[in-house]
Interface confidence: medium
């Protein structure tokens, strides 16, 4: 799997999308996990509804929410009130029994808010030609600012 990069702005919401083959993954619940090391485990953050038919319902763990369009074949994860510690490696997974297939490997990068008094420097504008060896960049920034949101806490 190549790594897909999603970049968001501190304090705002970032939406991560993971497309998949809806027929191949029919009847399977999905999950979003955080990679804890290069070869380490992927720690579950949030998973879709226990009843697959209700996967379209949004489920939340702290500031992370997940919803699955099982017909269209798109898993959507929303990270609210993005903070520097949210930066890192994640995976979208398709669950079957105790196994999990990786749908997409994701790198989340967090930028300082360019409209804040802390200037972010030259903010990259989507559409500029960039060349990456093994990554695809998705610029996915929402302007909605949510106050007082508590980020998903790590577990040791």
């Amino acid at each position: 799997h190549n790594t897909t990069v999603f970049q968001g702005v501190e304090g705002q919401s970032l939406q991560v999308s993971c497309p998949y083959d809806s027929m191949k993954h029919w009847g399977r619940r999905k999950a979003w996990c955080r990679q804890l090391g290069e070869k380490g485990p992927c720690q579950r953050v949030v998973s879709t509804h226990n009843l697959w038919l209700l996967s379209f319902l949004r489920r939340r763990n702290g500031s992370t929410a997940i919803t699955d369009d099982t017909l269209g074949g798109t898993l959507t994860i929303t990270l609210r009130n993005l903070q520097p510690h949210d930066a890192g490696f994640y995976q979208c997974q398709s669950l079957h029994g105790s196994e999990a297939d990786t749908l997409r490997k994701v790198l989340v990068e967090v930028l300082a808010d360019p409209l804040d008094h802390r200037d972010a420097g030259d903010l990259w504008v989507p559409g500029e030609s960039e060349s990456f060896e093994d990554a695809h960049v998705e610029h996915s920034i929402s302007r909605s600012l949510l106050e007082g949101e508590i980020p998903f806490p790590p577990t040791s």
Partner: antibody
Framework: QVQLVQSGAEVKKPGASVKVSCKAS????????ISWVRQAPGQGLEWMGW????????NYAQKLQGRVTMTTDTSTSTVYMELRSLRSDDTAVYYC????????????WGQGTLVTVSS | DIQMTQSPSSVSASVGDRVTVTCRAS??????LAWYQQKPGKAPKLLIY???SLQTGVPSRFSGSGSGTDFTLTISSLQPEDFATYSC?????????FGQGTRLEIK
């Protein structure tokens, strides 16, 4: 193994510029952002800013805004930090540091580059 | 900006002692705190991240605790190689900020 190797010590006059390099090896360069952190003699650590190795996006500390520029060269897996209009209080050891999997902390550091600003 | 204040600024201890260093944030940073060890002329080394998670390869005598604004680094039984400066760092919000450091000296 992961390594960040920085360029050598520099002596500069006030008002001049300095450009420090940080060559990364042992990992996929574009998968990790690099921060620059400096440490004045006998002082604590000061975060200067961060650059995305993917596309050169930057976040700079406000106090250095306008004087600092961070760039990357993916062909050589090298990150550069240029500081302009040097003052005596810019005398410090400058470190590059990789932001790893560990929730916004820095898991690998360069050996440091001493920049001395003196007339 | 979030200010990080460490105490004490220096501490003297002997091999085998239990040592505690504290770090206080000027506002709530949840659990987004890291601890580093730095020896003279060397780069910092990551010990603890996310307040209490031990970085791979770091001896288990090091431990971290706390959340919100008050955090603690504990060395359960000091070894000769532990004499160094210890710094905390918050990653809750930009700009990233560090404590001023705590120097651990041989008594």
């Amino acid at each position: 193994q992961v390594q960040l190797v920085q360029s050598g010590a520099e002596v500069k006059k006030p008002g001049a510029s300095v450009k420090v390099s940080c060559k990364a090896s042992g990992y996929t360069f574009t998968n990790y952002g690099i921060s620059w952190v400096r440490q004045a003699p006998g002082q604590g650590l000061e975060w200067m800013g961060w650059i995305s190795a993917y596309n050169g996006n930057t976040n700079y500390a406000q106090k250095l805004q306008g004087r600092v520029t961070m760039t990357t060269d993916t062909s050589t897996s090298t990150v550069y930090m240029e500081l302009r209009s040097l003052r005596s209080d810019d005398t410090a050891v400058y470190y590059c540091a990789r932001r790893g999997y560990s929730y916004g902390s820095f898991d690998y550091w360069g050996q440091g580059t001493l920049v001395t600003v003196s007339s | 900006d979030i200010q990080m204040t460490q105490s004490p600024s220096s501490v003297s201890a002997s091999v085998g002692d239990r040592v505690t260093v504290t770090c206080r944030a000027s506002q709530d940073i949840n659990s987004w705190l890291a601890w580093y060890q730095q020896k003279p002329g060397k780069a910092p080394k990551l010990l603890i991240y996310a307040a209490s998670s031990l970085q791979t390869g770091v001896p288990s005598r090091f431990s971290g605790s706390g959340s919100g604004t008050d955090f603690t680094l504990t060395i359960s039984s000091l070894q000769p190689e532990d004499f160094a400066t210890y710094s905390c760092q918050q990653s809750n919000s930009f700009p990233i900020t560090f404590g001023q450091g705590t120097r651990l000296e041989i008594k």
